[in-house]
């Protein structure tokens, strides 16, 4: 998994008038990291782990940078012609990655009312746009605006690749997010389903990184996909992730079933409890 930094900036217009507020969300290694609120922009770490990465001293820098980016995007929205009445949004998503071989990737994507209309590879400076005529009209409009100010294009948009990577490296230097591994807590529960059946649910929480294998086994053999129901792997707000898998089994056959978990090269097996709840910490 590469390390990544993702900026998601959103600005709004109402009846053609660009609103003063904006929203910025920043994700570090896929985790919600910072949030810059609409009216007053203050970078807020999402949970203790973000505070550990940033430290109080650097909040001003993030606030200043994000405010500047928000202003730039508002100006871009103001130059989009033919805005219809009502509420409209312009979103810019910027992503940079550092891979294990130290290679880098950077890209920038623009969305209007949630629809992608323009992308740029920030390394090659190549622009791409969808085929639809609406998207192409928007794309030409925005590209022309960005090209109007050649200095701005050079110093701001093409510098974003370097800036994003610089910020990512700065966060990684804190050591908090450097290839850490946090094992999951695995929790198996059972609940009555229909007559003669029970639903067994296996939850894994508090793990990092997000890649995990979680599945139900019968006699040691993985159940087929169509007999299991999986939850998404979601951030839990603490810099770690959570997910679950459930299946329905015949009452009295619990001893044949186990929840199998594999994470970061380690694994564990968890039986169905005879009572209501069984919580097990994976000890590696």
């Amino acid at each position: 998994e590469p390390h990544s930094l993702r900026y998601n900036l959103t600005v709004l217009s109402w009846d053609g008038s660009v609103q003063s507020g904006f929203l910025t969300e920043v994700h570090l290694d896929g985790q919600p990291f910072l949030r810059c609120d609409r009216q007053k922009c203050r970078a807020k770490p999402q949970g203790q782990w973000a505070e550990d990465v940033l430290g109080n001293k650097t909040w001003d820098r993030e606030t200043r940078d994000l405010t500047g980016n928000g202003k730039d995007l508002r100006m871009t929205l103001a130059h989009i012609k033919d805005q219809k009445e009502g509420l409209h949004s312009l979103q810019e998503i910027r992503v940079c990655e550092i891979h294990e071989d130290n290679s880098t990737r950077s890209s920038q994507h623009f969305y209007y009312d949630g629809e992608l209309f323009l992308s740029q590879n920030l390394e090659t400076k190549e622009w791409t746009m969808p085929q639809s005529s609406r998207a192409q009209t928007l794309a030409m409009n925005v590209r022309n605006f960005l090209k109007e100010d050649a200095m701005k294009t050079k110093t701001h948009y093409h510098a974003m690749h370097a800036d994003c990577l610089q910020e990512l490296r700065r966060y990684l230097k804190s050591g908090v997010v450097l290839r850490r591994t946090v094992p999951p807590m695995v929790n198996v529960t059972r609940s009555e389903a229909s007559e003669g059946n029970i639903t067994v649910t296996c939850r894994a929480s508090g793990f990092y990184p997000w890649n995990i294998t979680l599945s139900w086994r019968q006699d040691g053999v993985s159940l087929s996909h169509d007999t299991q129901q999986w939850g998404d792997v979601l951030p839990d707000g603490n810099g770690t992730y959570q997910t679950w898998v459930a299946t329905r089994i015949c009452q009295g056959e619990e001893q044949r079933f186990t929840c199998y978990m594999e994470h970061s090269g380690n694994h564990s097996t968890h039986p169905v409890p005879s009572g209501k709840v069984l919580v097990l910490q994976s000890h590696w």
């Epitope: 006699d219 040691g220 053999v221 087929s224 186990t258 594999e262 564990s268 097996t269 039986p271």
Partner: antibody, heavy 118, light 108 residues
Framework: EIQLVQSGAEVKKPGSSVKVSCKPS????????IYWVRQAPGQGLEWIGY????????IYNQQFKDRATLTVDKSTSTAYMELSSLRSEDTAVYYC???????????WGQGTLVTVSS | EIVLTQSPATLSLSPGERATLSCSAS???????LHWYQQKPGQAPRLLIY???NLASGIPARFSGSGSGTDFTLTISSLEPEDFAVYYC?????????FGQGTKVEIK
């Protein structure tokens, strides 16, 4: 490469016990169940039971419950099957096998011939 | 206990011919729990087909499986010399896990 290596052939007297070992390699020992199956000369396959090496859970074929004992030694990544009160009809090749992702027996040991004779 | 009955007990065929082996279960089995194994003299069985119709790793495409409920079939489209062996079906749906008594495919 995944392999399961079993202990050598045994000749036993009726009423005695035999303990067959199975040492898997090429995968994490505790990640898959170890099954035991036997095959009498010229006969079909008969499932004895399995053990989950991670939690130590054992499921036996009721037919063998009173005489078979399945164990594992996690420190040496070895599984064992002990059969007691041997009789002549226990003469068979005993196989260990690994549970697979999609089937009960995806890799097999080479087999251990146990001969019960007075 | 689910009893698996294989037929025929012996199948005498020549290389290049088609082999059809049957496995009949005493109770209905989900297709996810029916597997086939091949065993040659002096060797351990090896997984051939899992979950009724899926080829195990390294198994040639001339082998195929089908069926549902209580009736399952293993087909070898064109027998090769190395295919002459004993074939077992096995169910993993309910305990005890059981095997069929085997079908021997021999050279005619």
């Amino acid at each position: 490469e995944i392999q399961l290596v079993q202990s050598g052939a045994e000749v036993k007297k009726p009423g005695s016990s035999v303990k067959v070992s199975c040492k898997p390699s090429g995968y994490a020992f505790t990640s898959n169940n170890i099954y035991w199956v036997r095959q009498a000369p010229g006969q079909g396959l008969e499932w004895i039971g399995y053990i989950d090496p991670y939690i130590g859970r054992i499921i036996y074929n009721q037919q063998f419950k009173d005489r078979a004992t399945l164990t594992v030694d996690k420190s040496t990544s070895t599984a064992y099957m002990e059969l007691s009160s041997l009789r002549s009809e226990d003469t068979a090749v005993y196989y260990c096998s690994r549970s697979g992702e999609r089937s009960n027996f995806d890799y097999w040991g080479q087999g251990t011939l146990v001969t019960v004779s007075s | 206990e689910i009893v698996l009955t294989q037929s025929p007990a012996t199948l005498s065929l020549s290389p290049g011919e088609r082999a059809t082996l049957s496995c009949s279960a005493s109770s209905s089995i989900s297709s996810n729990y029916l597997h086939w194994y091949q065993q040659k003299p002096g060797q351990a069985p090896r997984l051939l087909i899992y979950r009724t119709s899926n080829l195990a790793s390294g198994i040639p495409a001339r082998f195929s499986g089908s069926g549902s409920g209580t009736d399952f079939t293993l087909t070898i489209s064109s027998l090769e010399p190395e295919d002459f062996a004993v074939y077992y079906c096995q169910q993993g749906g309910s305990l005890p896990l059981t095997f069929g008594q085997g079908t021997k495919v021999e050279i005619k």
